[in-house]
């Protein structure tokens, strides 16, 4: 008799299969131990890391990972060819760009090679797991006496990303933030020339090419005002 455990984590295809883990119910067999959950992130659609918590195993175990793409030309089962290690135990797998198909359902299977029946399968939508690189080349332009425009670049297709700009002055205790769409441009209409401003930006693969929840790292900050703006009042791009 097999017990089927459903372990949805919000990334499964709700119109198709949930995540399935089948475990024999042999009394106190090692097979009944659940396998750790696999977490995958696609970094700027350049490579993908799928990792698990290897320390959750009762004893050090080199778990193996297989993957395939459901209902597609890429449905052949593939072995992980580049394992990641934590204290000499497998703790993840890195897939290269050519192995990543964002818009096909990615199926990942973790297995205990010493107990082949002990396996867990998850289905992931990779377009919801993309994390872009942090924005680069932040620049500030003075549009008028009191208006600043912040621009930046991303190393990805512009329309696939949305952005979050944060700024504050040296007098502020917290950041003010503003969402920005794919146009990657932000204007601050009222700037106090007596204050020093700091700006930073992060980006997310949402909503036009995917529905990712995770943001990139913050960009390097850029500063404007008081002791810096005198050097060039029309263009300033100093990274801290």
């Amino acid at each position: 008799l097999n017990t089927t455990i459903l372990t949805p984590n919000g990334n499964e295809d709700t119109t198709a299969d949930f995540f399935l883990t089948t475990m024999p119910t042999d009394s106190l067999s090692v097979s009944t131990l659940p396998l750790p959950e696999v977490q995958c992130f696609v970094f700027n659609v350049e490579y993908m890391n799928c990792t698990w918590n290897s320390s959750s195993e009762p004893q050090p175990t080199n778990l193996t990972l297989h993957y395939w793409y459901k209902n597609s030309d890429n449905d052949k089962v593939q072995k992980c060819s580049h394992y990641l290690f934590s204290e000499e135990i497998t703790s993840g797998c890195q897939l290269q760009k050519k192995e990543i198909h964002l818009y096909q359902t990615f199926v990942v299977q973790l297995q205990d090679p010493r107990e082949p029946r002990r396996q867990a399968t998850q289905m992931l939508k990779l377009q919801n797991l993309v994390i872009p690189w942090a924005p680069e080349n932040l620049t500030l332009h003075k549009l008028s006496e009191s208006q600043l425009e912040l621009n930046w670049n991303n190393r990805f297709l512009n329309h696939c990303l949305e952005h979050l700009v944060q700024y504050r002055t040296d007098w502020d205790h917290s950041w003010t933030e503003q969402s920005v769409d794919y146009r990657h441009k932000f204007s601050l209409p009222s700037v106090d020339g007596q204050k020093r401003y700091t700006f930073r930006v992060r980006s997310r693969f949402n909503p036009l090419c995917g529905s990712a929840q995770h943001w990139s790292e913050w960009s390097h900050p850029i500063h404007w005002g008081s002791n810096t703006s005198k050097e060039n009042p029309f263009l300033f791009a100093l990274e801290a």
Epitope: H101, Y103, Q104, C209
Partner: nanobody, 125 residues
Framework: QVQLQESGGGSVQAGGSLRLSCTAS????????MGWYRQAPGNECELVST???????YYTDSVKGRFTISQDNAKNTVYLQMNSLGPEDTAVYYC???????????????????WGQGTQVTVSS
Amino acid sequence: QVQLQESGGGSVQAGGSLRLSCTASGFTFDDSDMGWYRQAPGNECELVSTISSDGNTYYTDSVKGRFTISQDNAKNTVYLQMNSLGPEDTAVYYCAAEPRGYYSNYGGRRECNYWGQGTQVTVSS
């Protein structure tokens, strides 16, 4: 910085031909799906043709047999050869870039202003 620059538009008589070009920079061209959209005054943005990174092509029904999409990875350029043009093809044509696999497995309506300035094609009868 990601940039798409269209060229090759112009005015032509019905039955004539034009070849549109789009030069891309700032992203990995040969790992992207490319496409052409068009927008006539008062109309929505319409997907005309796409070419995927593996060479698969798509054409909207109204241009099948008349338009041909192709790409030159060495030049980071995608082309749209348009033959037997009619007045109904009059529009601004926009070049588009998408993540690999977007067109064949995902899709979704696009606004033409996501990309470049476009190139005007005018066909008179």
